[in-house]
Protein backbone atom coordinates (compact mmCIF):
# COMPACT_ATOMS: atom_id res chain seq x y z
CA UNK A 1 0.00 0.00 0.00
CA UNK A 2 1.21 3.46 -0.87
CA UNK A 3 -0.12 6.96 -0.43
CA UNK A 4 -0.25 7.40 -4.19
CA UNK A 5 -0.13 4.77 -6.86
CA UNK A 6 0.13 5.35 -10.57
CA UNK A 7 -1.81 2.62 -12.29
CA UNK A 8 -1.16 1.67 -15.88
CA UNK A 9 -3.62 -1.19 -16.29
CA UNK A 10 -2.39 -2.26 -19.70
CA UNK A 11 0.93 -4.06 -19.80
CA UNK A 12 0.84 -3.81 -23.56
CA UNK A 13 -1.10 -2.03 -26.27
CA UNK A 14 -1.11 -3.12 -29.89
CA UNK A 15 -1.88 -0.63 -32.60
CA UNK A 16 -1.83 -0.93 -36.36
CA UNK A 17 0.26 1.63 -38.17
CA UNK A 18 -1.72 4.80 -38.81
CA UNK A 19 -4.10 4.16 -35.94
CA UNK A 20 -4.33 5.93 -32.60
CA UNK A 21 -2.84 4.38 -29.46
CA UNK A 22 -4.56 4.90 -26.12
CA UNK A 23 -2.24 4.65 -23.13
CA UNK A 24 -4.21 4.39 -19.91
CA UNK A 25 -3.09 5.83 -16.58
CA UNK A 26 -4.87 6.71 -13.37
CA UNK A 27 -3.61 7.94 -10.02
CA UNK A 28 -5.11 6.78 -6.75
CA UNK A 29 -4.68 10.19 -5.17
CA UNK A 30 -4.13 13.79 -6.19
CA UNK A 31 -1.96 14.44 -3.17
CA UNK A 32 0.82 15.47 -3.29
CA UNK A 33 0.27 18.24 -5.79
CA UNK A 34 2.23 17.96 -9.01
CA UNK A 35 1.94 17.19 -12.70
CA UNK A 36 1.80 13.94 -14.61
CA UNK A 37 4.31 13.37 -17.39
CA UNK A 38 4.53 10.59 -19.96
CA UNK A 39 7.86 9.21 -21.11
CA UNK A 40 8.96 6.62 -23.64
CA UNK A 41 11.67 4.51 -22.11
CA UNK A 42 13.28 4.77 -18.71
CA UNK A 43 16.46 6.22 -17.32
CA UNK A 44 18.31 9.39 -18.25
CA UNK A 45 17.74 8.97 -21.99
CA UNK A 46 13.96 8.74 -21.75
CA UNK A 47 11.89 10.74 -24.22
CA UNK A 48 9.23 13.16 -22.97
CA UNK A 49 5.93 12.41 -24.70
CA UNK A 50 3.58 14.64 -22.72
CA UNK A 51 3.80 17.06 -19.80
CA UNK A 52 0.62 18.11 -17.98
CA UNK A 53 2.33 21.25 -16.77
CA UNK A 54 3.64 22.77 -19.98
CA UNK A 55 4.74 22.15 -23.56
CA UNK A 56 3.31 21.49 -27.01
CA UNK A 57 2.65 17.90 -28.02
CA UNK A 58 0.76 17.92 -31.34
CA UNK A 59 0.28 14.16 -31.65
CA UNK A 60 -0.92 13.73 -28.07
CA UNK A 61 -4.38 14.33 -26.67
CA UNK A 62 -5.65 13.56 -23.19
CA UNK A 63 -8.55 11.15 -22.81
CA UNK A 64 -10.08 13.17 -19.96
CA UNK A 65 -10.30 16.89 -19.45
CA UNK A 66 -7.35 17.43 -17.15
CA UNK A 67 -8.74 20.77 -16.05
CA UNK A 68 -11.84 19.00 -14.75
CA UNK A 69 -12.08 19.13 -10.98
CA UNK A 70 -10.27 16.31 -9.15
CA UNK A 71 -9.51 14.42 -12.35
CA UNK A 72 -7.39 11.34 -11.71
CA UNK A 73 -7.41 9.93 -15.24
CA UNK A 74 -4.19 10.79 -17.02
CA UNK A 75 -4.63 8.56 -20.05
CA UNK A 76 -3.39 9.85 -23.38
CA UNK A 77 -3.94 9.14 -27.05
CA UNK A 78 -1.08 9.22 -29.55
CA UNK A 79 -2.21 9.66 -33.14
CA UNK A 80 -0.85 8.30 -36.40
CA UNK A 81 1.22 5.52 -34.86
CA UNK A 82 4.28 4.34 -36.76
CA UNK A 83 6.66 1.47 -35.98
CA UNK A 84 9.08 4.07 -34.61
CA UNK A 85 6.64 4.67 -31.74
CA UNK A 86 7.10 1.16 -30.36
CA UNK A 87 8.47 1.04 -26.87
CA UNK A 88 7.50 1.14 -23.21
CA UNK A 89 5.61 4.21 -22.07
CA UNK A 90 5.65 5.34 -18.46
CA UNK A 91 3.11 7.55 -16.73
CA UNK A 92 5.00 9.43 -14.02
CA UNK A 93 3.62 11.52 -11.18
CA UNK A 94 5.77 14.45 -10.07
CA UNK A 95 5.40 16.37 -6.84
CA UNK A 96 6.06 20.02 -6.42
CA UNK A 97 9.53 20.58 -5.13
CA UNK A 98 11.68 23.55 -4.46
CA UNK A 99 12.81 24.73 -6.88
CA UNK A 100 11.97 21.96 -9.39
CA UNK A 101 9.30 19.28 -9.49
CA UNK A 102 10.51 15.92 -8.23
CA UNK A 103 9.61 12.52 -9.67
CA UNK A 104 7.32 10.92 -7.12
CA UNK A 105 5.84 7.71 -8.53
CA UNK A 106 5.95 5.92 -11.84
CA UNK A 107 3.49 3.53 -13.36
CA UNK A 108 4.63 0.05 -14.30
CA UNK A 109 4.77 0.96 -17.97
CA UNK A 110 2.78 0.06 -21.05
CA UNK A 111 4.49 -1.58 -23.99
CA UNK A 112 3.30 -0.21 -27.30
CA UNK A 113 3.73 -2.49 -30.27
CA UNK A 114 2.64 -2.47 -33.87
CA UNK A 115 -0.05 -5.06 -33.85
CA UNK A 116 -0.84 -8.18 -35.88
CA UNK A 117 -4.01 -10.19 -35.56
CA UNK A 118 -3.95 -13.96 -35.15
CA UNK A 119 -5.22 -16.03 -38.01
CA UNK A 120 -8.54 -17.80 -37.63
CA UNK A 121 -8.00 -20.80 -35.34
CA UNK A 122 -8.03 -24.13 -37.14
CA UNK A 123 -9.29 -27.06 -35.09
CA UNK A 124 -8.44 -30.61 -36.08
CA UNK A 125 -9.72 -33.77 -34.54
CA UNK A 126 -8.39 -37.34 -34.55
CA UNK A 127 -7.91 -39.15 -37.81
CA UNK A 128 -10.14 -42.06 -36.76
CA UNK A 129 -13.48 -42.09 -35.01
CA UNK A 130 -13.70 -43.07 -31.38
CA UNK A 131 -16.48 -44.42 -29.21
CA UNK A 132 -18.04 -42.98 -26.06
CA UNK A 133 -15.97 -43.08 -22.86
CA UNK A 134 -12.82 -42.74 -24.92
CA UNK A 135 -10.60 -39.66 -24.71
CA UNK A 136 -9.73 -37.98 -27.97
CA UNK A 137 -7.36 -35.11 -28.73
CA UNK A 138 -8.14 -31.96 -30.65
CA UNK A 139 -5.55 -29.49 -31.83
CA UNK A 140 -5.96 -25.78 -32.42
CA UNK A 141 -3.54 -23.61 -34.32
CA UNK A 142 -3.36 -19.89 -34.97
CA UNK A 143 -0.52 -17.93 -36.52
CA UNK A 144 0.92 -14.54 -37.27
CA UNK A 145 0.00 -12.57 -34.18
CA UNK A 146 1.91 -9.99 -32.19
CA UNK A 147 2.57 -9.34 -29.39
CA UNK A 148 3.14 -12.72 -27.83
CA UNK A 149 0.51 -12.45 -25.09
CA UNK A 150 -2.53 -14.45 -26.12
CA UNK A 151 -5.26 -16.39 -24.37
CA UNK A 152 -6.61 -19.65 -25.69
CA UNK A 153 -9.64 -21.38 -24.26
CA UNK A 154 -11.37 -24.60 -25.15
CA UNK A 155 -15.10 -25.17 -24.88
CA UNK A 156 -17.36 -28.13 -25.41
CA UNK A 157 -20.96 -27.04 -25.91
CA UNK A 158 -20.25 -23.78 -24.13
CA UNK A 159 -18.59 -25.42 -21.14
CA UNK A 160 -14.96 -24.50 -20.66
CA UNK A 161 -12.49 -27.36 -20.78
CA UNK A 162 -9.51 -27.57 -18.49
CA UNK A 163 -7.50 -30.50 -19.83
CA UNK A 164 -5.33 -28.91 -22.47
CA UNK A 165 -1.75 -27.88 -23.15
CA UNK A 166 -0.77 -24.75 -25.04
CA UNK A 167 2.50 -23.57 -26.54
CA UNK A 168 3.34 -20.21 -28.04
CA UNK A 169 6.30 -20.12 -30.42
CA UNK A 170 8.91 -18.85 -30.66
CA UNK A 171 9.89 -18.41 -27.02
CA UNK A 172 12.07 -15.36 -27.66
CA UNK A 173 11.40 -12.03 -29.34
CA UNK A 174 9.85 -12.22 -32.77
CA UNK A 175 7.90 -10.19 -35.30
CA UNK A 176 4.98 -12.59 -34.97
CA UNK A 177 4.02 -15.69 -33.04
CA UNK A 178 2.06 -18.91 -33.38
CA UNK A 179 0.00 -20.80 -30.85
CA UNK A 180 -0.62 -24.53 -30.74
CA UNK A 181 -2.92 -26.18 -28.25
CA UNK A 182 -4.03 -29.76 -27.69
CA UNK A 183 -7.17 -30.49 -25.71
CA UNK A 184 -8.37 -33.83 -24.43
CA UNK A 185 -12.10 -34.52 -24.67
CA UNK A 186 -13.97 -37.47 -23.20
CA UNK A 187 -16.72 -38.57 -25.56
CA UNK A 188 -20.24 -39.41 -24.40
CA UNK A 189 -23.11 -41.06 -26.24
CA UNK A 190 -24.83 -37.70 -26.51
CA UNK A 191 -21.99 -36.00 -28.36
CA UNK A 192 -23.22 -36.35 -31.95
CA UNK A 193 -24.51 -32.79 -31.90
CA UNK A 194 -21.65 -31.52 -29.74
CA UNK A 195 -19.09 -28.97 -30.82
CA UNK A 196 -15.58 -28.35 -29.63
CA UNK A 197 -14.58 -24.70 -29.86
CA UNK A 198 -11.13 -23.21 -29.64
CA UNK A 199 -11.32 -19.53 -28.68
CA UNK A 200 -8.39 -17.20 -29.09
CA UNK A 201 -8.38 -13.81 -27.39
CA UNK A 202 -5.76 -11.25 -28.32
CA UNK A 203 -5.37 -7.53 -27.78
CA UNK A 204 -5.81 -6.91 -31.48
CA UNK A 205 -9.28 -8.41 -31.44
CA UNK A 206 -10.85 -5.73 -29.23
CA UNK A 207 -12.61 -8.21 -26.98
CA UNK A 208 -14.13 -10.19 -29.84
CA UNK A 209 -12.25 -13.50 -29.80
CA UNK A 210 -11.68 -15.67 -32.83
CA UNK A 211 -13.18 -19.13 -32.76
CA UNK A 212 -12.45 -22.34 -34.53
CA UNK A 213 -14.87 -25.24 -34.29
CA UNK A 214 -14.93 -28.96 -34.77
CA UNK A 215 -18.11 -31.01 -34.81
CA UNK A 216 -17.89 -34.15 -32.76
CA UNK A 217 -20.11 -35.78 -35.36
CA UNK A 218 -16.89 -36.07 -37.38
CA UNK A 219 -15.14 -37.78 -34.49
CA UNK A 220 -17.60 -39.93 -32.63
CA UNK A 221 -18.84 -43.38 -33.38
CA UNK A 222 -21.77 -44.55 -31.29
CA UNK A 223 -22.11 -48.32 -31.70
CA UNK A 224 -25.62 -49.66 -32.00
CA UNK A 225 -27.53 -51.71 -29.50
CA UNK A 226 -29.39 -54.65 -30.97
CA UNK A 227 -32.66 -56.20 -29.91
CA UNK A 228 -34.15 -59.19 -31.70
CA UNK A 229 -37.88 -59.68 -31.13
CA UNK A 230 -40.32 -62.28 -32.31
CA UNK A 231 -43.51 -60.65 -33.57
CA UNK A 232 -47.03 -62.08 -33.70
CA UNK A 233 -47.45 -64.79 -36.35
CA UNK A 234 -48.67 -63.77 -39.76
CA UNK A 235 -49.81 -67.25 -40.68
CA UNK A 236 -49.84 -70.72 -39.24
CA UNK A 237 -46.37 -71.53 -40.44
CA UNK A 238 -44.69 -68.14 -40.47
CA UNK A 239 -42.88 -66.20 -37.74
CA UNK A 240 -41.91 -62.53 -38.10
CA UNK A 241 -38.64 -61.67 -36.34
CA UNK A 242 -37.43 -58.07 -36.10
CA UNK A 243 -34.00 -56.71 -35.34
CA UNK A 244 -34.10 -53.27 -33.73
CA UNK A 245 -30.83 -51.40 -34.28
CA UNK A 246 -30.80 -48.45 -31.93
CA UNK A 247 -28.75 -45.38 -31.11
CA UNK A 248 -25.98 -45.63 -33.69
CA UNK A 249 -23.86 -43.03 -35.42
CA UNK A 250 -22.80 -42.50 -38.16
CA UNK A 251 -25.47 -43.91 -40.41
CA UNK A 252 -23.20 -46.25 -42.36
CA UNK A 253 -24.51 -49.66 -41.34
CA UNK A 254 -25.04 -53.06 -42.96
CA UNK A 255 -27.24 -55.77 -41.51
CA UNK A 256 -27.14 -59.44 -42.32
CA UNK A 257 -29.68 -62.09 -41.30
CA UNK A 258 -28.37 -65.58 -40.77
CA UNK A 259 -30.49 -68.72 -40.37
CA UNK A 260 -28.48 -71.37 -38.61
CA UNK A 261 -25.33 -69.57 -39.65
CA UNK A 262 -26.25 -69.21 -43.29
CA UNK A 263 -26.74 -65.81 -44.82
CA UNK A 264 -30.38 -65.22 -45.46
CA UNK A 265 -30.43 -61.55 -46.41
CA UNK A 266 -28.12 -58.51 -46.33
CA UNK A 267 -29.32 -54.96 -46.41
CA UNK A 268 -27.95 -51.46 -45.89
CA UNK A 269 -29.58 -49.01 -43.53
CA UNK A 270 -31.53 -46.54 -45.60
CA UNK A 271 -34.76 -45.21 -44.14
CA UNK A 272 -33.45 -44.59 -40.66
CA UNK A 273 -35.12 -42.48 -37.99
CA UNK A 274 -33.09 -39.84 -36.21
CA UNK A 275 -33.17 -39.42 -32.45
CA UNK A 276 -33.02 -36.06 -30.70
CA UNK A 277 -29.39 -36.67 -29.75
CA UNK A 278 -28.44 -37.16 -33.40
CA UNK A 279 -28.11 -40.94 -33.28
CA UNK A 280 -30.14 -43.19 -35.54
CA UNK A 281 -32.55 -46.09 -35.15
CA UNK A 282 -33.34 -48.66 -37.76
CA UNK A 283 -35.40 -51.83 -37.86
CA UNK A 284 -35.09 -54.88 -40.08
CA UNK A 285 -37.47 -57.82 -40.11
CA UNK A 286 -37.26 -61.36 -41.29
CA UNK A 287 -40.21 -63.63 -42.13
CA UNK A 288 -39.31 -67.23 -41.24
CA UNK A 289 -41.22 -70.13 -42.75
CA UNK A 290 -41.21 -72.58 -39.85
CA UNK A 291 -42.63 -75.43 -41.94
CA UNK A 292 -39.52 -75.35 -44.08
CA UNK A 293 -37.43 -76.31 -41.05
CA UNK A 294 -37.36 -79.68 -39.49
CA UNK A 295 -34.95 -78.74 -36.76
CA UNK A 296 -34.70 -75.80 -34.40
CA UNK A 297 -33.76 -72.51 -36.09
CA UNK A 298 -31.12 -70.12 -34.81
CA UNK A 299 -31.71 -66.65 -36.23
CA UNK A 300 -28.87 -64.14 -36.01
CA UNK A 301 -29.03 -60.41 -36.69
CA UNK A 302 -25.49 -59.37 -37.56
CA UNK A 303 -24.61 -55.70 -37.89
CA UNK A 304 -21.48 -54.16 -39.31
CA UNK A 305 -21.38 -50.51 -38.31
CA UNK A 306 -19.04 -47.98 -39.88
CA UNK A 307 -16.50 -50.60 -40.91
CA UNK A 308 -16.14 -52.00 -37.42
CA UNK A 309 -16.17 -55.70 -36.53
CA UNK A 310 -19.67 -57.08 -36.70
CA UNK A 311 -21.85 -57.37 -33.63
CA UNK A 312 -24.74 -59.79 -33.50
CA UNK A 313 -27.74 -60.87 -31.53
CA UNK A 314 -29.32 -64.32 -31.87
CA UNK A 315 -32.78 -65.70 -31.36
CA UNK A 316 -33.70 -69.41 -31.17
CA UNK A 317 -36.85 -70.79 -32.69
CA UNK A 318 -37.83 -74.29 -31.63
CA UNK A 319 -39.71 -75.99 -34.40
CA UNK A 320 -42.85 -77.64 -32.89
CA UNK A 321 -46.55 -78.01 -33.60
CA UNK A 322 -48.42 -74.73 -33.17
CA UNK A 323 -46.58 -71.46 -33.15
CA UNK A 324 -47.93 -68.69 -30.95
CA UNK A 325 -46.98 -65.08 -30.14
CA UNK A 326 -43.75 -64.71 -28.27
CA UNK A 327 -42.31 -62.02 -26.00
CA UNK A 328 -39.28 -59.79 -26.46
CA UNK A 329 -35.63 -60.48 -26.21
CA UNK A 330 -34.26 -57.71 -24.05
CA UNK A 331 -30.68 -58.83 -23.63
CA UNK A 332 -28.42 -55.85 -24.11
CA UNK A 333 -25.01 -57.18 -25.06
CA UNK A 334 -23.69 -57.96 -28.50
CA UNK A 335 -24.00 -61.71 -28.56
CA UNK A 336 -26.14 -64.12 -26.68
CA UNK A 337 -28.84 -66.70 -27.13
CA UNK A 338 -32.44 -66.37 -26.09
CA UNK A 339 -34.73 -69.29 -26.62
CA UNK A 340 -38.26 -68.87 -27.90
CA UNK A 341 -40.24 -72.11 -28.10
CA UNK A 342 -42.98 -72.60 -30.67
CA UNK A 343 -45.49 -75.23 -29.63
Amino acid sequence: EEELQVIQPDKSVLVAAGETATLRCTATSLIPVGPIQWFRGAGPGRELIYNQKEGHFPRVTTVSDLTKRNNMDFSIRIGNITPADAGTYYCVKFRKGSPDDVEFKSGAGTELSVRAKPSAPVVSGPAARATPQHTVSFTCESHGFSPRDITLKWFKNGNELSDFQTNVDPVGESVSYSIHSTAKVVLTREDVHSQVICEVAHVTLQGDPLRGTANLSETIRVPPTLEVTQQPVRAENQVNVTCQVRKFYPQRLQLTWLENGNVSRTETASTVTENKDGTYNWMSWLLVNVSAHRDDVKLTCQVEHDGQPAVSKSHDLKVSAHPKEQGSNTAAENTGSNERNIY
Epitope: K53, T67, K96
Partner: antibody, heavy 114, light 111 residues
Framework: QVQLQESGPGLVKPSQTLSLTCTVS????????VNWIRQPPGKGLEWIGI???????DYNSALKSRVTISKDTSKNQVFLKLSSVTAADTAVYYC????????WGQGTTVTVSS | DIVLTQSPASLAVSPGQRATITCRAS??????????MHWYQQKPGQPPKPLIY???NLESGVPARFSGSGSGTDFTLTINPVEANDAANYYC?????????FGGGTKVEIK
Protein backbone atom coordinates in the same frame (compact mmCIF):
# COMPACT_ATOMS: atom_id res chain seq x y z
CA GLN B 1 -4.53 -0.62 11.89
CA VAL B 2 -2.60 2.58 11.15
CA GLN B 3 -0.95 4.08 14.22
CA LEU B 4 1.67 6.75 14.88
CA GLN B 5 3.29 7.41 18.25
CA GLU B 6 5.61 10.30 19.07
CA SER B 7 8.25 9.95 21.79
CA GLY B 8 11.16 11.92 23.12
CA PRO B 9 12.31 14.07 26.03
CA GLY B 10 9.67 16.38 27.38
CA LEU B 11 12.20 18.98 28.43
CA VAL B 12 15.02 20.45 26.34
CA LYS B 13 17.40 23.18 27.33
CA PRO B 14 17.70 26.29 25.17
CA SER B 15 20.34 26.12 22.42
CA GLN B 16 20.26 22.31 22.52
CA THR B 17 18.86 19.98 19.89
CA LEU B 18 15.35 18.63 20.22
CA SER B 19 15.16 14.99 19.11
CA LEU B 20 11.86 13.17 18.63
CA THR B 21 10.91 9.78 17.26
CA CYS B 22 7.69 8.81 15.49
CA THR B 23 7.10 5.06 15.56
CA VAL B 24 4.54 3.87 13.02
CA SER B 25 2.61 0.67 12.43
CA UNK B 26 0.00 -0.47 9.95
CA UNK B 27 1.77 1.00 6.93
CA UNK B 28 5.17 1.07 5.30
CA UNK B 29 7.52 4.02 5.44
CA UNK B 30 8.64 3.20 1.91
CA UNK B 31 5.09 3.72 0.66
CA UNK B 32 4.04 6.72 2.70
CA UNK B 33 5.50 10.02 3.72
CA VAL B 34 5.44 11.26 7.32
CA ASN B 35 4.99 14.88 8.39
CA TRP B 36 5.99 16.68 11.53
CA ILE B 37 3.62 19.39 12.75
CA ARG B 38 3.76 21.39 15.96
CA GLN B 39 1.31 23.41 18.01
CA PRO B 40 2.51 25.96 20.60
CA PRO B 41 0.33 26.14 23.73
CA GLY B 42 -3.01 27.79 22.93
CA LYS B 43 -2.00 28.50 19.34
CA GLY B 44 -2.51 27.12 15.87
CA LEU B 45 -0.75 24.42 13.88
CA GLU B 46 2.59 24.83 12.11
CA TRP B 47 3.94 22.43 9.51
CA ILE B 48 7.59 21.58 10.09
CA GLY B 49 8.33 19.26 7.17
CA ILE B 50 7.86 15.89 5.54
CA UNK B 51 9.99 12.89 4.67
CA UNK B 52 8.63 11.08 1.63
CA UNK B 53 8.58 7.36 0.98
CA UNK B 54 11.71 7.60 -1.14
CA UNK B 55 13.55 9.36 1.68
CA UNK B 56 13.52 12.84 0.17
CA UNK B 57 12.49 15.72 2.41
CA ASP B 58 10.76 19.07 2.23
CA TYR B 59 10.94 21.59 5.06
CA ASN B 60 9.21 24.72 6.17
CA SER B 61 11.52 27.49 4.98
CA ALA B 62 11.14 29.27 8.31
CA LEU B 63 12.74 26.31 10.09
CA LYS B 64 14.84 24.81 7.32
CA SER B 65 18.22 25.81 8.69
CA ARG B 66 17.51 24.07 11.99
CA VAL B 67 15.48 21.00 10.94
CA THR B 68 16.47 17.52 9.91
CA ILE B 69 13.94 14.74 9.30
CA SER B 70 15.21 11.22 8.73
CA LYS B 71 13.96 7.67 9.09
CA ASP B 72 14.87 4.08 9.75
CA THR B 73 12.51 2.10 7.56
CA SER B 74 13.49 -1.25 9.09
CA LYS B 75 12.47 0.00 12.54
CA ASN B 76 9.38 1.84 11.27
CA GLN B 77 10.68 5.05 12.82
CA VAL B 78 10.88 8.66 11.67
CA PHE B 79 13.09 11.16 13.45
CA LEU B 80 12.90 14.91 13.94
CA LYS B 81 15.88 16.96 14.98
CA LEU B 82 15.47 20.66 15.68
CA SER B 83 18.67 22.43 16.65
CA SER B 84 19.35 25.63 18.60
CA VAL B 85 15.97 25.55 20.29
CA THR B 86 14.48 28.49 22.14
CA ALA B 87 11.38 28.94 24.27
CA ALA B 88 9.47 29.64 21.05
CA ASP B 89 9.93 25.98 20.12
CA THR B 90 7.87 24.87 23.13
CA ALA B 91 4.91 23.01 21.62
CA VAL B 92 3.05 19.77 21.20
CA TYR B 93 4.80 17.95 18.35
CA TYR B 94 2.75 15.68 16.11
CA CYS B 95 3.67 13.27 13.38
CA UNK B 96 1.08 12.62 10.68
CA UNK B 97 0.97 10.23 7.76
CA UNK B 98 1.39 11.27 4.16
CA UNK B 99 0.74 14.38 2.15
CA UNK B 100 -2.90 13.97 3.00
CA UNK B 101 -2.21 13.91 6.76
CA UNK B 102 -4.93 11.31 7.18
CA UNK B 103 -3.61 9.77 10.42
CA TRP B 104 -2.03 11.62 13.34
CA GLY B 105 -0.18 10.60 16.45
CA GLN B 106 -1.43 11.74 19.86
CA GLY B 107 1.39 14.25 20.11
CA THR B 108 4.21 14.74 22.58
CA THR B 109 4.76 17.89 24.60
CA VAL B 110 8.22 19.45 24.46
CA THR B 111 9.12 22.30 26.77
CA VAL B 112 12.21 24.35 26.12
CA SER B 113 13.44 25.69 29.41
CA SER B 114 16.62 25.95 31.37
CA ASP C 1 4.24 31.67 1.96
CA ILE C 2 0.52 31.22 1.44
CA VAL C 3 -1.33 32.78 4.33
CA LEU C 4 -4.66 31.25 5.27
CA THR C 5 -7.07 33.57 7.07
CA GLN C 6 -10.01 31.95 8.81
CA SER C 7 -13.15 33.74 9.86
CA PRO C 8 -14.72 34.10 12.21
CA ALA C 9 -12.15 33.43 14.90
CA SER C 10 -14.95 31.94 16.97
CA LEU C 11 -18.67 31.37 16.72
CA ALA C 12 -21.43 30.03 18.92
CA VAL C 13 -24.14 27.92 17.30
CA SER C 14 -27.25 26.27 18.63
CA PRO C 15 -27.71 22.54 18.02
CA GLY C 16 -29.62 21.97 14.80
CA GLN C 17 -28.40 25.23 13.28
CA ARG C 18 -25.86 25.71 10.50
CA ALA C 19 -22.25 26.73 11.17
CA THR C 20 -20.20 28.26 8.37
CA ILE C 21 -16.45 28.81 8.52
CA THR C 22 -14.52 30.49 5.75
CA CYS C 23 -10.86 30.25 4.81
CA ARG C 24 -9.25 32.76 2.47
CA ALA C 25 -5.85 32.07 0.92
CA SER C 26 -3.42 34.81 0.03
CA UNK C 27 -3.00 33.14 -3.36
CA UNK C 28 -4.71 30.38 -5.25
CA UNK C 29 -4.25 26.87 -3.94
CA UNK C 30 -5.57 25.34 -7.17
CA UNK C 31 -3.34 23.18 -9.35
CA UNK C 32 -4.05 20.73 -12.15
CA UNK C 33 -7.80 20.95 -11.71
CA UNK C 34 -7.88 20.43 -7.95
CA UNK C 35 -8.00 22.65 -4.88
CA UNK C 36 -5.36 21.55 -2.40
CA MET C 37 -7.27 22.77 0.63
CA HIS C 38 -8.19 20.54 3.56
CA TRP C 39 -10.10 20.89 6.83
CA TYR C 40 -9.38 19.46 10.28
CA GLN C 41 -11.27 19.31 13.57
CA GLN C 42 -9.35 19.45 16.85
CA LYS C 43 -10.78 18.93 20.29
CA PRO C 44 -8.84 19.85 23.46
CA GLY C 45 -6.04 17.40 24.27
CA GLN C 46 -6.46 15.57 20.97
CA PRO C 47 -4.66 15.64 17.63
CA PRO C 48 -6.41 17.16 14.63
CA LYS C 49 -8.89 14.89 12.87
CA PRO C 50 -9.20 15.11 9.06
CA LEU C 51 -12.69 16.13 7.88
CA ILE C 52 -12.47 17.29 4.28
CA TYR C 53 -9.76 16.85 1.67
CA UNK C 54 -9.31 18.56 -1.68
CA UNK C 55 -11.83 21.25 -0.70
CA UNK C 56 -14.97 19.14 -0.94
CA ASN C 57 -14.27 15.45 -0.36
CA LEU C 58 -15.50 13.93 2.87
CA GLU C 59 -12.98 11.79 4.73
CA SER C 60 -14.05 8.23 5.47
CA GLY C 61 -16.13 7.98 8.62
CA VAL C 62 -16.94 11.68 8.80
CA PRO C 63 -20.67 12.46 9.07
CA ALA C 64 -22.34 13.99 6.02
CA ARG C 65 -23.29 16.96 8.20
CA PHE C 66 -19.84 18.26 7.30
CA SER C 67 -19.29 19.62 3.81
CA GLY C 68 -16.67 21.69 2.06
CA SER C 69 -16.75 23.93 -0.97
CA GLY C 70 -14.75 26.54 -2.80
CA SER C 71 -11.84 26.90 -5.17
CA GLY C 72 -8.98 29.24 -5.86
CA THR C 73 -8.65 31.39 -2.78
CA ASP C 74 -12.05 31.15 -1.05
CA PHE C 75 -13.19 28.08 0.80
CA THR C 76 -16.01 27.20 3.17
CA LEU C 77 -16.57 24.49 5.75
CA THR C 78 -20.24 23.98 6.64
CA ILE C 79 -21.67 21.96 9.53
CA ASN C 80 -25.40 21.43 9.13
CA PRO C 81 -27.02 20.60 11.42
CA VAL C 82 -24.62 21.27 14.26
CA GLU C 83 -24.53 18.75 17.11
CA ALA C 84 -23.25 19.18 20.65
CA ASN C 85 -20.09 17.15 20.05
CA ASP C 86 -19.06 19.42 17.17
CA ALA C 87 -17.64 21.88 19.69
CA ALA C 88 -13.98 22.10 18.65
CA ASN C 89 -11.37 24.14 16.84
CA TYR C 90 -11.43 23.88 13.04
CA TYR C 91 -8.41 24.46 10.83
CA CYS C 92 -7.98 24.82 7.10
CA UNK C 93 -4.69 23.71 5.56
CA UNK C 94 -3.13 24.00 2.11
CA UNK C 95 -0.49 21.81 0.55
CA UNK C 96 -0.38 23.38 -2.88
CA UNK C 97 2.81 25.31 -2.20
CA UNK C 98 5.68 24.93 0.23
CA UNK C 99 5.67 25.59 3.04
CA UNK C 100 2.38 23.91 3.74
CA UNK C 101 0.36 26.18 5.98
CA PHE C 102 -2.59 26.11 8.34
CA GLY C 103 -5.22 28.73 9.04
CA GLY C 104 -5.30 30.30 12.46
CA GLY C 105 -8.31 28.24 13.49
CA THR C 106 -11.97 28.84 14.27
CA LYS C 107 -13.40 27.94 17.65
CA VAL C 108 -16.94 26.56 17.44
CA GLU C 109 -18.95 26.66 20.66
CA ILE C 110 -22.38 25.15 21.16
CA LYS C 111 -24.99 27.39 22.79
Amino acid sequence: QVQLQESGPGLVKPSQTLSLTCTVSGFSLTGYGVNWIRQPPGKGLEWIGIIWGDGSTDYNSALKSRVTISKDTSKNQVFLKLSSVTAADTAVYYCARAGKMDYWGQGTTVTVSS
Amino acid sequence: DIVLTQSPASLAVSPGQRATITCRASESVDSYGSSFMHWYQQKPGQPPKPLIYLASNLESGVPARFSGSGSGTDFTLTINPVEANDAANYYCQQNNEYPWTFGGGTKVEIK
